[in-house]
């Protein structure tokens, strides 16, 4: 059962796993949620009745019954992890804590103009977990405006104390705000020879990489595959670090793979969710339960629904035994990974999907693409919205994309002549325009935010945000699309689609069914040659076939150019302008979203 509220002046008795320090009860709850075993916690707030050495302690707890006895204690705040909840969870913490000094290893000290600049510095430093900034009112003159970057083994402070005129906060890497390079390459036959900070067992290099990504100290990893010659090291995942933040060298070793933490780009790839099944593989660990199950998929569901289950092994039924049901072994360990992995015993293993909600909603796998045909099917493009105007009569105005639970990204040129957001309606989860009736639910628009450098589509900055009056509840038919990562500017997208209800030819009408077309990207140099009278800037991106025939057209404006990369869909472009529609050697021109990520984040995260 999901319990989100915090229990004031209440302490849970027993069940202690470990104690960490957090600046607030809210953050203690997040730490508990991300800890592999924590189900409950007790946080001690600052209080004259409490020993100051106990202030800001966050005791992580576990219980077989999923609850513990409650005791009244002033200044104690207790609660449950969000593991039991189905809603989206994020480790992103933008809060700034005034008059708190978060202790850790101070490895970098520099002058900064503001706490925000200090936080940005921390976010863009590979080692930084949190920071403390001495404001200009700080008593000691030589420490004023000093930004201390800090790290610890756990990623949380080793202690927190009260200190006047300082502020502290966390790195925003988990908010996808880092400008650090995102190195997605996996290196076969390679070992990185640097300090091991931890080691876990993993079924493959991808799981090893994901574990590295959400381990606070891991910057890169080496994984020994099941063919590794030394039996005791097979399936071993070594989590590594170095002073420079990069491996000092690469050593060639057969049957080993190495790679990097994806902490700088984790918003656009699943990190916590290990959804694959591992055949002829047994995961060893502490046994939680043994249940009969019809299939390994059913076993995974059982594990996902059992809040303490972290991974499982399913042994298929022997011939006619037990009504064709096999045995489902639900398991757990201290770190969430198997204690040993064995092969050749016929088991099928996997992980709980409970952690999938800790990944950005935009990374969720959606319905597979329907190949061929131009009409979409329901749920194929769940981020696509239809934006209607009600003045003078109701009609489809533009497309748009869901990028957050209160935000639609679209084109600025859609709002020519739109005097007020009151006349706008956003419909999501729509396949056919004919579904929209008087009583069809929609989202009202609270605010239209047009880029302040926008003048006309052809000169760029053709981008706008719509803030919705109410939040979107994510479902299979309405969910967000990932923004491209700034570290991915080098990525070559090869699987790009434009979608919309727009015209199918220049003189036409709005289509009833959402249309789709796969379109190749065109280099800006090539695009510039096709539009000699215009300036194709790096803030634009072009797509189209040389021979024409497939393109966005009137009514598609503001809609997405969606590209699939590493199994995740990214909003690469916003349909903006072009010469005619689908004309030979006239590619469509789109707003290059990656160039506006900072602007989007600035506007959507403004308080």
């Amino acid at each position: 059962e999901c319990v989100t509220q915090l229990l004031k002046d209440t302490c849970f008795e027993g069940g202690d796993i470990t104690t960490v320090f957090t600046p607030s009860a809210k953050y203690c709850q997040v730490v508990c949620t991300y800890h592999p075993r924590c189900l409950l916690f007790t946080f001690t707030a600052e209080s004259p009745s409490e020993d100051p050495t106990r202030w800001f302690t966050c005791v992580l707890k576990d219980s077989v019954t999923e609850t513990l006895p409650r005791v009244n204690r002033t200044a104690a705040i207790s609660g449950y992890s969000f593991k039991q909840c189905s809603h989206q969870i994020s480790a992103c913490n933008k809060d700034i804590y005034v008059d708190l000094d978060m202790k850790g290893i101070n490895y970098n000290s520099s002058v900064a103009k503001s706490a925000q600049e200090c936080q940005e510095r921390c976010t863009d430093d590979v080692h930084c977990h949190f920071f403390t900034y001495a404001t200009r009112q700080f008593p000691s003159l030589e420490h004023r405006n000093i930004c201390l970057l800090k790290h610890t083994q756990t990623g949380t402070p080793t202690r927190i104390t009260k200190l006047d005129k300082v502020v502290s906060g966390f790195s925003l890497k988990s908010c996808a705000l880092s400008n650090l390079a995102c190195i997605r390459d996996i290196f076969p036959n390679t070992v990185f020879a640097d300090s091991n900070i931890d080691s876990v067992m993993a079924p493959d290099a991808f799981v090893c990489g994901r574990i590295c990504t959400h381990h606070p100290g891991c910057l890169f990893f080496t994984f020994f595959s099941q063919e590794w010659p030394k039996e005791s090291q097979r399936n071993l995942c070594l989590l590594k670090t170095s002073e420079s933040g990069l491996p000092s060298t690469r050593i060639k070793k057969s049957k080993a793979l190495s790679g990097f933490s994806l902490q700088s780009c984790r918003h656009s790839i699943p990190v916590f969710c290990h959804s694959s099944f591992y055949h002829d593989t047994d995961f060893l660990g502490e046994e939680l339960d043994i249940v009969a199950a019809k299939s390994h998929e059913a076993c995974q569901k059982l594990c996902t629904n059992a809040v303490r289950c972290q991974f499982f092994t399913y042994t298929p039924a022997q011939a006619s035994c037990n009504e064709g049901k096999g045995k489902c072994y639900l398991k757990l360990s201290s770190n969430g990974s198997p204690t040993k992995i064995l092969h050749g015993r016929g088991g099928i293993s996997g992980y709980t999907l409970r952690l999938c909600k800790m990944d950005n909603e935009c990374t969720t796998k959606i319905k597979p693409r329907i190949v061929g045909g131009t009409a979409s099917v329901r749920g194929e493009w769940p981020w696509q919205v239809t934006l209607h105007t009600t003045s003078p009569t109701q009609r489809h105005l533009c497309g748009g994309s869901i990028i957050g639970n209160q935000w639609i990204l679209t084109a600025a040129h859609c709002f020519y002549g739109v005097e007020s957001p009151k006349i706008l309606r956003v419909y999501s989860g729509i396949l056919n325009q004919s579904e929209i009736k008087e009583d069809t639910s929609f989202f009202g628009v609270q605010e239209i935010i047009i880029h302040d450098q926008y003048k006309m589509a052809e000169s760029g900055y053709d981008i706008a945000l719509l803030k919705l009056e109410t939040t979107v509840n994510y479902t299979d038919s309405q969910r967000p699309i990932c923004l491209p990562s700034k570290g991915d500017r080098n990525v070559i997208y090869t699987d790009c689609w434009v979608t919309g209800w727009g015209y199918r030819k220049l003189r036409d009408k709005i289509q009833n069914t959402l249309q789709k077309a796969k379109i190749p990207l065109v280099t800006n140099e090539e695009c510039q040659k096709r539009y000699r009278g215009h300036k194709i800037t790096h803030k634009m991106i072009c797509a189209g076939y040389r021979e024409g025939g497939k393109d966005a057209c009137k009514g598609d404006s503001g809609g997405p150019l969606s590209c699939k990369h590493n199994e995740v869909w990214h909003l690469v472009g916003i349909t903006s302008w072009g010469e005619g529609c689908a004309q030979r050697e006239r590619p469509g021109v789109y707003t290059n979203v990656v160039e506006y990520v900072d602007w989007i984040l600035e506007k959507t995260q403004a308080v």
Partner: antibody
Framework: EVQLLESGGGLVQPGGSLRLSCAAS????????MAWVRQAPGKGLEWVSS????????LYADSVKGRFTISRDNSKNTLYLQMNSLRAEDTAVYYC???????????WGQGTLVTVSS | DIQMTQSPSSVSASVGDRVTITCRAS??????LAWYQQRPGKAPKLLIY???TLQSGVPSRFSGSGSGTDFTLTINSLQPEDFATYYC?????????FGQGTRLEIK
Amino acid sequence: EVQLLESGGGLVQPGGSLRLSCAASGFTFSDYEMAWVRQAPGKGLEWVSSIVPSGGWTLYADSVKGRFTISRDNSKNTLYLQMNSLRAEDTAVYYCATWGDSWGFDFWGQGTLVTVSS
Amino acid sequence: DIQMTQSPSSVSASVGDRVTITCRASQGISSWLAWYQQRPGKAPKLLIYDASTLQSGVPSRFSGSGSGTDFTLTINSLQPEDFATYYCQQADSFPIAFGQGTRLEIK
């Protein structure tokens, strides 16, 4: 057919700078690690620098560390080598090459000559 | 860092001969060694990797052997186009190092 075409070489004074380019075609450039290898006149081969497919990690020989910068633009299928603070001993033919899973240089360009002399 | 030493620095032979070039690593490199051929005025060409695996398209008269620190490249029945300079390269770890080269010339 894999093709690597270097350009940008020439005569430069000691302390000067030069930027080499390598245009790649005939393979998926963004999937390959790339490298620069040089050969001084009448001498052997010397590995200079490597860059991973994403461009996020670069490695250098000690002899060029801090002076040379390798980079790539996957959208243009091009590899670069920015050479600063050039010395007479940097005079060589500079080759661009693909680095394969075999840990060997699979394909090479024809090379571009860099002469550092006053 | 690993150093590579080739011997001899040059060798003379005739068409049809069998030639062996050796390469020694300053420390054990398992079988992680590559061999290259470079004809005058041309770019090097990968012949062998992992000490003994022939790169596709390379004639079978070329063969490699060895592991640890000592390696050999053998060319059976020399052809006119084989007269070139040969380099070994350690593929064990970065920084990558080449041998100084062995010039194979016509006797």
